[in-house]
Each structure stands twice: as C-alpha cells, then as structure tokens.
C-alpha cells in the first residue's frame, strides 16, 4: 500500500509527587516501521528510561504504537517526542498542564 503518515498525540498524567508520565502515541500509519523516542534537550533518552508499546495493527490496515517516560514536573520544556517514518520526521512537545491533548498529522 501507499505510505500513510502517523497521527502523533502527546499526553501527560500525574505520576508520583513531583513527577509526571508523558506518553507519545503514533497511530494510523503505514508501513509499520517507525522510530518513536523521547528526547531531552534533543538527545534521545536511554532505553532503560523509556517504555515502548508494540507496533500493532489498528484494524484499518494501518498501525499504532506508543512510548512513555517519567519526567520531573517543571522540566517539560526540555522534553520532546521524536518521530521518524518513511523518510519524514517530526518533533512534538509536552502539552502544558491545562492542555492534555496535542494531535498532529504529518505528511
């Protein structure tokens, strides 16, 4: 099939005191090969500080996956979710505390 770029959605949720969990979800993409990782100051976090979901079919002939990490509240500006798919890339910030959903479709 033809390339379908992912929808990328970053959310945040309360973790332990002083920390938040940030999750980056990529959905509705094809083919299934994708790079999704959290960066701090533009540098990829080590694998042991991130949790990845499997790349799974979403039932529409496309795929979905996610990556999450825990960060200190107040340091959100240092972190971005980086996505690479089919030769295209994008960077996605952590939403501010009063805005929990950012959706971006990349072409």
């Amino acid at each position: 099939g033809s390339t379908v770029p992912p929808m990328v959605n970053v959310t945040r949720s309360e973790a332990s005191e002083g920390n938040i969990t940030v999750t980056c979800r990529a959905s509705s993409f094809y083919p299934r090969n994708i790079i999704l990782t959290w960066r701090q100051d533009g540098v990829s976090l080590s694998h042991d500080t991130q949790q990845w979901g499997d790349v799974l079919p979403d039932g529409n002939g496309t795929y979905q996956t996610w990556v999450a990490t825990r960060i200190c509240r107040g340091e959100e500006q240092r972190f971005t979710c980086y996505m690479e798919h089919s030769g295209n890339h994008s960077t996605h910030p952590v939403p501010s505390g009063n805005s929990h959903h950012h959706h971006h479709h990349h072409h």
């Epitope: 960066r39 701090q40 100051d41 533009g42 540098v43 990829s44 976090l45 080590s46 500080t49 500006q77 240092r78 971005t80 980086y82 690479e84 890339h89 994008s90 960077t91 996605h92 910030p93």
Partner: antibody, heavy 118, light 108 residues
C-alpha cells in the same frame, strides 16, 4: 558527511550587536537541535542555549537570556545567534553544534571569532 | 548549576604513557549525562566519549571512560602524539549545561 559551516570573523564596538550564522549540511536540518557555545581566549567552554528547528523552541542559559537571540531560517536551513549590547568580555570564539542521538554536542562548526574592541 | 571540576589542570606526560583525567561534579549525575570532548589548538572540540563510557565514532580504543555519581574518569592507555590536547567533561543532566574547565595533556 555532516558539516556545520559558520560565518566569518567579526570585529565590533562595545554596545553593538553581532549576528553569527551556522549552516548545517548532510542531515535533515529540522531533525536535531542546534546548540551554541562560546570560548573566550584561553578559557573553557560556555553553553549559551539551543533551538529546536522543527518547533522553534528555544532554551537559554539564564546568563545569556537577556542578550542572546537564537533563530532559524528553515527555508535556507540556517541557524543564527545574535548577541546584543556587546562588551569586551564577549570577545570569544562562538561555536554552533548539533545535538546528537546520545550526547548534547556531536558535530561542531569551525567557530566564529567575535572581537569586541573600541 | 552543576559545577564540574577537572583535575589536574595540566598533565605532563611522554608518548606511550598512561593518562588519567578526573572530572568531579558538585551534584550526582546519571552516567547517561556525562560526556568527554577533545580540543586541539585552533580547532573545535570533538566528541570523544558519550554517556560516561561509550566511544564516539572513529575514536581509537586506547580511550576509555568510567565513573558514576560525582566522580568520572577519562583514561588514555598509551598516549600517541596526536592525543596531546585539552580534554573537557560536560554534563547534560540539568540546566544550565556545563563543562569542566579542561585538562591540558602536554608533552613532557
């Protein structure tokens, strides 16, 4: 081959401003942050700030927040550092660098000497 | 601000000798955030070791890094003539990003 090419040396009067450019090549410009670092003659390295060219986010070292301005021109894949209200202590070599996959500074420009003298 | 203190300031050694450079941090740093750079006169720094102990691309195996917490070490097992330079440690764990003041490795 990844390269970062900077603009040439500058001589400025105290109180003036300077704008240094950095043109990376060999990779997708918006995929990595551009950092700026300076080095006074015979001294160590001092981080000024960085910019994410994709979303335009800028993080400054608080020490430079009032005088440094980081920008990018995505149409020409060029990053800029402008430093205002120059004083003699700003005489230094200014470097741009690219954020790496596993370290903050993986490739560097050749440096731009800025001399501030009356 | 995390202050990185490098010692010694200058190391005078002969080719073939072992060089041990220290970097001490004012606060604990995860090993993922400690990097080393080499700078020769008139040149830009270049990445030598990332994340405490990993050799950057093209860096010979005589270079090695170790450490944890507040104390980190760069070792050059047998100095080659091209290794005489200034070495900087750098931390990326907290802002502002900071460098050590450098250790100059000079020919004895």
């Amino acid at each position: 081959e990844i390269q970062l090419v900077q603009s040439g040396a500058e001589v400025k009067k105290p109180g003036a401003s300077v704008k240094v450019s950095c043109k990376p090549s060999g990779y997708a410009f918006t995929s990595n942050n551009i950092y700026w670092v300076r080095q006074a003659p015979g001294q160590g390295l001092e981080w000024i700030g960085y910019i994410d060219p994709y979303i335009g986010r800028i993080i400054y070292n608080q020490q430079f927040k009032d005088r440094a301005t980081l920008t990018v021109d995505k149409s020409t894949s060029t990053a800029y550092l402008e430093l205002s209200s120059l004083r003699s202590e700003d005489t230094a070599v200014y470097y741009c660098s690219r954020s790496g996959e596993r370290s903050n500074f993986d490739y560097w420009g050749q440096g731009t000497l800025v001399t501030v003298s009356s | 601000e995390i202050v990185l203190t490098q010692s010694p300031a200058t190391l005078s050694l002969s080719p073939g000798e072992r060089a041990t450079l220290s970097c001490s941090a004012s606060s604990s740093i995860s090993s993922n955030y400690l990097h080393w750079y080499q700078q020769k006169p008139g040149q830009a720094p270049r990445l030598l070791i990332y994340r405490t102990s990993n050799l950057a691309s093209g860096i010979p195996a005589r270079f090695s890094g170790s450490g944890s917490g507040t104390d980190f070490t760069l070792t050059i097992s047998s100095l080659e003539p091209e290794d005489f330079a200034v070495y900087y440690c750098q931390q990326g764990g907290s802002l502002p990003l900071t460098f050590g003041q450098g250790t100059k490795v000079e020919i004895k």
